[in-house]
Interface confidence: low
């Protein structure tokens, strides 16, 4: 048994540009606290896997309020060591996870708003009883300076805290069951503690945690008699030729007990002795319950308050993780279209749209004509969430900036001659043809294929009639088009102005909430 100790020296912005000025969010003051988590071995474990060697939480640090003009300082830290007691042997190789948490001090209703600011994970080798090890680690834009050590607690001694010793000075000689501690003359040592459940009659150990079998016995706890009938000649556990290995693993082989639990065999099964804080057949249930308030960031804890039931955190929007400790960066999915600015308000996403765009995700292209005037006398026409320019004669393109010859496409049929005009093109038709594009032949009796001409137009003057008809139709169409566009544009702008005012009002209230 022993204690792992961690001393945080400083936490603050790392060197270089882009370092954060403050750990607090825009909501106001905050304070820091730290969580240390120890996992055995050097394997890269998932962040959610249990801290099998133990974990500890620091006190809250002093309240920090950002001074706008002051340089970003090292942040005020909680006092004291973080101590993680370990009950069994110190493994020597371990994973050290240090998390820096921020507690916001705004006016939440149900509980403080916690969020994970930085996490460093380091795999380390460390002997118990050694000096303090110093380290500096970067986590994103933050820098953490700390020292750590592992020390045994008497009667445990040694680099793994597995040798059990008692000072000799108190009793003048070693008490019952104790023998002198080999390298230390003034201490006494207990015989090694064998693996839990090791048979007292048929097993023994020279190192703690092992179970070596006497001749004629086998199995992980030396409880299985060696059969002499079917296994003769096989090399048994005590290197004789009379025993044999029991086929198949014993129930405790591979240790089915999770989270540092120790396994002992029972007839036909096994039993786990769980470390403090874990429960269940295989010690798989964390002893933390809803009664401990384990859900961060306003997560709702669901599960019994009795020690035997696990808990589940239901996270509010914007958070995830088994304890709602991770903020979801929903803006990373770039939900705002057309260059809109994404704002993650925690419970909702908002898009602040660029000029000319609207809608929850800036998906509507307003492209108001005022902002995108059509050049060279072109007329702006809105419709369907987009705009287009109706260009004056001789110009084309999206904004009427490109020169164009309306007669280039030879629009006049049957040899008619094309003339560019301010209101469009006009066709001068060859004899025998009439119409806006000279498309109608005039019949030999002087009557065209068009309906009867109104009074005042002589059928014998088809060219003039065609030109006048074209001009009348074009003028009426332009006037009607302008009226329709003005009305629809007014309606459309009123609708979007109203929506924008409402949306900006909501956003302002939520950002200030």
């Amino acid at each position: 048994a022993g204690v792992f100790e961690l001393q945080i020296h400083s936490f603050g912005p790392g060197p270089g540009p882009g370092a954060p000025r403050s750990p607090c969010s825009a909501r106001g003051p905050c304070r820091l606290f730290f969580r240390v988590c120890l996992k055995p071995g050097l394997s890269e474990e998932a962040a959610e896997s249990p801290c099998a060697l133990g974990a500890a939480l620091s006190a809250r640090g002093p309240v920090y309020t950002e001074q706008p003009e002051a340089p970003a300082p090292d942040l005020p830290l909680p006092n004291g060591l973080l101590q993680v007691p370990f009950r069994d042997a110190w493994p020597g190789t371990f994973s050290l996870i240090i998390e820096t948490w921020r507690e916001e001090l705004g006016d939440q209703i149900g509980g403080p708003a916690w969020s994970l600011l930085a996490r460093v994970t380091r795999r380390r080798r460390l002997a118990a009883g050694g000096p303090w090890a110093r380290d500096i680690q970067r986590a994103g834009a933050w820098e953490l300076r700390f020292s750590y050590r592992a020390r045994c607690e008497l009667p445990a001694v040694g680099t793994a805290c597995t040798r059990l010793c008692r000072p000799r000075s108190a009793p003048s000689r070693c008490g019952p069951g104790l023998r002198p501690c080999a390298p230390l003359e003034d201490e006494c040592e207990a015989p090694p503690v064998c693996r839990a459940g090791c048979s007292l009659e048929h097993g023994f150990c020279e190192q703690p945690g092992e179970c070596r079998c006497l001749e004629g016995w086998t199995g992980p706890l030396c409880m299985v008699p060696v059969s002499t009938s079917s296994c003769l000649g096989l090399r048994g556990p005590s290197s004789t030729t009379t025993g044999c290995l029991v086929p198949g693993p014993g129930p405790c082989d591979g240790n089915p007990c999770a989270n540092g639990g120790s396994c002992s065999e029972t007839p036909g099964s096994f039993e786990c002795t769980c470390p403090r804080g874990f429960y269940g057949l295989r010690c798989e249930v964390s002893g933390v319950t809803c009664a401990d308030g384990p859900c961060f960031n306003g997560g709702l804890c669901v599960g019994g308050a009795d020690p035997d039931s696990a808990y589940i955190c239901h996270c509010p929007p914007g958070f995830q993780g088994s304890n709602c400790e991770k903020r979801v960066d929903r803006c990373s999915l770039q939900p705002c279209r057309n260059g809109g600015l994404c704002l993650d308000l925690g419970h909702a996403l908002r898009c602040r749209c660029r000029a000319g765009f609207a809608g929850p995700r800036c998906e509507h292209d307003l492209d108001d004509c005022a902002g995108r005037a059509c050049a060279n006398g072109g007329t702006c026409v809105e419709g369907g969430g987009a705009h287009r320019c109706s260009c004056a004669l001789g110009f084309g393109g999206r904004n009427c900036r490109e020169r164009a010859d309306p007669c280039a496409a030879r629009p006049c049929a049957h040899g008619g001659r094309c003339y560019a005009h301010f209101s469009g093109l006009v066709c001068a038709c060859a004899p025998g043809y009439m119409g806006a594009r000279c498309e109608f032949p005039v019949h030999p009796d002087g009557v065209s294929a068009l309906p009867a001409a109104p009074p005042g137009l002589r059928p014998g003057d088809p060219q003039r009639a065609g030109v006048i008809a074209v001009i009348v139709v074009v003028v009426i169409a332009i006037v009607a088009g302008i009226v329709v566009l003005v009305i629809s544009r007014k309606k459309r702008m009123a609708k979007y102005e109203k929506a924008e005012i409402k949306e900006m009002g909501e956003m302002h209230r939520e950002l200030n909430a």
Partner: antibody, heavy 117, light 107 residues
């Protein structure tokens, strides 16, 4: 099992004082913000006061209608929260509940306060 | 303060019928709404949190829905033991506020 148990209600005259108590069991009391919520036929459920944690310097919040008259306090060693009510008015009459949890998931059985002359 | 308005004030239903209770917020409260059941002579109990999440041990005939300003509690097939007052509450902005309640009676 989580239990919240209120006590201290009774009959009091307008202008008088009363202290309500609530003792919690089955939770790590010092980790939870504690609230008082009251209920009357006229006003329904109404949040009254809140006290936060030692790490928050036991910050308190009150409904406008009780500010300056009511004081909420807690004793983590006893797992208890208190509501000291002074200058009581007839509209303070009702069942007073002690509640906690992010969405007020734990409630006591309530204690009845009657303010009447 | 945000005002929560419940309707109807009371309703009488037969066992097996579908019941719909309404709660409207005076402002956008996201999904930060809870529903509480209060049986006669008992304290309120949390039924639904976050507008639509059923709390531990709540039968699945209870369903919450809605967001922003309009919220609904539905009991798909009402049982005799559902006789109670039902309250909605918002936890979006400080202070939290509750609706006036809906009394559900069983015919």
């Amino acid at each position: 099992e989580v239990k919240l148990e209120e006590s201290g209600g009774g009959l009091v005259q307008p202008g008088g004082s009363m202290k309500l108590s609530c003792v919690a069991s089955g939770i790590t009391f010092s980790n939870f913000w504690m609230n008082w919520v009251r209920q009357s036929p006229e006003k329904g459920l109404e949040w009254v006061a809140q006290i936060r944690l030692k790490s928050d310097d036991y910050a308190t919040h009150y409904a406008e209608s009780v500010k300056g008259r009511f004081t909420i306090s807690r004793d983590d060693s006893k797992g208890s929260v208190y509501l000291q009510m002074n200058n009581l008015r007839t509209e303070d009459t009702g069942i007073h509940y002690c509640t906690t949890g992010y969405y007020f998931d734990y409630w006591g059985q309530g204690t009845t306060l009657t303010v009447s002359s | 303060n945000i005002v929560m308005t419940q309707s109807p004030k009371s309703m009488s239903m037969s066992v097996g019928e579908r019941v719909t209770l309404s709660c409207k917020a005076s402002e956008n409260v996201g999904t930060y709404v809870s529903w509480f059941q209060q049986k006669p002579e008992q304290s309120p109990k949390l039924l639904i949190y976050g507008a639509s999440n059923r709390y531990t041990g709540v039968p699945d005939r209870f369903t919450g829905s809605g967001s922003a300003t309009d919220f609904t509690l539905t009991i798909s097939s009402v049982q005799a033991e559902d006789l109670a007052d039902y309250h909605c509450g918002q936890f979006y902005s400080f202070p939290c506020t509750f609706g006036g309640g809906t009394k559900l009676e069983i015919k």
